[in-house]
Amino acid sequence: TLNSVLNSNAIKNLPPPLGGAAGHPGSAVSAAPGILYPGGNKYQTIDNYQPYPCAEDEECGTDEYCASPTRGGDAGVQICLACRKRRKRCMRHAMCCPGNYCKNGICVSSDQNHFRGEIEETITESFGNDHSTLDGYSRRTTLSSKMYHTKGQEGSVCLRSSDCASGLCCARHFWSKICKPVLKEGQVCTKHRRKGSHGLEIFQRCYCGEGLSCRIQKDHHQASNSSRLHTCQRH
């Protein structure tokens, strides 16, 4: 079994998958909004969803951070919480929504002239899965001050979307995060119906681009509630 993986920092007890993958008839492949989906056409709903447990911010979605759900709560019980918007109180950068950072306890905008050059953040991948480089040497990725002066291009390692160049977001790729293209109109998207209601998406998608929202594709309205295809559509 993969219990050892489930007990690692990277994967906790996965919540039910979101409905959303729709196969292409006659094709040997299906497009899936998130990479951890069951076989067949029966998808569980998330009506009885339990909050997604976490040990560190990197386990949560791009618009979430990992913390105890109650003030002064048990530090051992942490879940993915919705990120804090501008002018909200914070204790660290990860608490602030993409495009913002934590300054003097308040989430403020990361404008183009301000780079967190003094911060060096390290992605530590201390999960149960072995991760080795293809050339056989282990690698630890450090995001130094230089990264904040050159916005990450597609495929660059990132911590959050503000690290990526325009048109890209920071999305999970295995147990790292890389800059991927923001979704365009008509592209399949992942609809998280409730904050934090995602499993670990090993191949995570970006969010829909400006002026677009992730909605049920019109011709899929008649499909069963749990297997609807969501695409980026104009507001």
Epitope: A32, S132, T133, R139, G155, H173, F174, P181, V188, R205
Partner: nanobody, 117 residues
Framework: EVQLVESGGGLVQAGGSLRLSCAAS????????MGWFRPAPGKEREFVAG????????YYADSVKGRFTISGDNAKNTVYLQMNSLKPEDTAVYYC??????????WGQGTQVTVSS
């Protein structure tokens, strides 16, 4: 449209070996990486092994570490899973998946691996 086709599954005795292949065709975009997954009783498809072309890394689940080896050729759009010292609990349909830069994530149809004791 990308199509992923797995092959190499079959029936093998415990302790034996198999080599799975996954070939991607119809790709017009680059791939960030590919992975192998398998279902577990009462659970979603679970991660087995993965290879990231972008990061130059390979990843393994603890349960297969030291027994399975993932390799591949991004230029040939192919990924392999060499499975050694197979155990009955490795019996499953093995699925290949790809993290594509066109924002779609693609699944193959799967190949059955059966390990008899």
């Amino acid at each position: 449209e990308v199509q992923l086709v797995e092959s190499g599954g079959g029936l093998v005795q415990a302790g034996g070996s198999l080599r799975l292949s996954c070939a991607a065709s119809g790709r017009t975009f680059s791939s960030y990486g590919m992975g192998w997954f398998r279902p577990a009783p009462g659970k979603e498809r679970e991660f087995v092994a993965g290879i990231s072309w972008t990061l130059g890394r390979t990843y393994y689940a603890d349960s297969v570490k030291g027994r399975f080896t993932i390799s591949g050729d991004n230029a040939k759009n192919t990924v392999y899973l060499q499975m050694n010292s197979l155990k009955p609990e490795d019996t499953a349909v093995y699925y290949c998946a790809s993290d594509e830069s066109d924002a779609y994530n693609y699944w193959g149809q799967g190949t059955q691996v059966t390990v008899s004791s």
